[in-house]
């Protein structure tokens, strides 16, 4: 009888471990989905708000090709900057090419001068790889020039005509980006 109870207890224990594992996997999946959901909402919000607006970019945004850019007038830490962009139906700037980098730095010179602006680039804590917010790697010519001495999480920012890195928990301006509305002519 005692052996039977012991076996049942072990089976229950095993079942509990499996459930805990499943719950952990589910939590990770949910977190990943929540982030993807945010991006989808940002994209949808952008599409819907653009549909009511004939200009390719909202007021106070700058257009270059198929992108609209917003240069903030407020300081935030990196994570809050990302949230601020999401509220506007956009994401932190993702620089795809040298041409785009040149446009951004040229525009910043005209607008504000030599300040720091967060972009959507962060360093993976485990591998040390730089990743854009969509999970892609920056092209070799668009890697931050200096490695931050910070032991904390490290994120990318633009200053003058350089891409640099800093502790994500410092305050900087930021740049948001979203798709420009195609004019339906």
């Amino acid at each position: 009888k005692l052996l039977q109870v012991s076996t049942i207890a072990m089976q229950q224990q095993e079942k509990l471990i499996q459930q805990e594992r499943a719950l952990l996997n589910f939590t990770e999946w949910k977190r990943s989905c929540a982030l993807q959901m945010k991006y989808c909402q940002a994209f949808m919000q952008n599409s819907l708000s653009s549909a009511h607006n004939s200009s390719p970019c909202p007021n106070n945004w700058i257009q270059n090709r198929e992108s609209c850019y917003y240069v903030s007038e407020i300081w935030s830490i990196w994570h809050t900057s990302q949230e601020n962009c999401l509220k506007e139906g956009s994401t932190l700037l993702q620089i795809e090419s040298k041409e785009e980098m040149d446009f951004i730095t040229g525009s910043l010179r005209k607008i504000k001068g030599s300040y720091d602006y967060w972009v959507g680039l962060s360093q993976d804590g485990h591998s040390g790889r730089w990743l854009w917010q969509d999970g892609s790697s920056p092209s070799p010519g668009l890697l931050p020039a200096e490695r931050s001495q910070s032991a904390n999480q490290v994120c990318g920012y633009v200053k003058s005509n350089s891409l640099l890195s800093s502790n994500c928990s410092t305050w900087k301006y930021f740049i948001c980006e979203k798709y420009a509305l195609r004019s339906s002519v």
């Epitope: 300081w75 935030s76 830490i77 900057s81 601020n84």
Partner: nanobody
Amino acid sequence: QVQLQESGGGLVQAGGSLRLSCAASGRTFSTYAMGWFRQAPGKERGLVAAISWSGGSTYYADSVKGRFTIFRDNAENTVYLQMNSLKPEDTAVYYCAAEAEGSGREGNFYERSWYQGQGTQVTVSS
């Protein structure tokens, strides 16, 4: 758009005191948190002190605790930073800051976004 005008900076001997003032205009002052940032040459900008909309909650960087006091006068739309026992390492440009969105929260100043003034230079000589 909020406008912030700092005053009270200057040159002071180590051990001395200064009081920085910041007059805010452009919106309802009493519903927003206010703060002071500073940036020394070659250093990151950092939050020195912050105060909630009600004055019920304050934040101080470890390096200034016990020496600096932040307080606000909602009737006058002004926030102050009283700086005592100043040290050479307090030398920096000090920026007044206003919370970008009136969240009504008391704490957690770290994750807020801030409008900032033009800055006022504070130099502490030894």
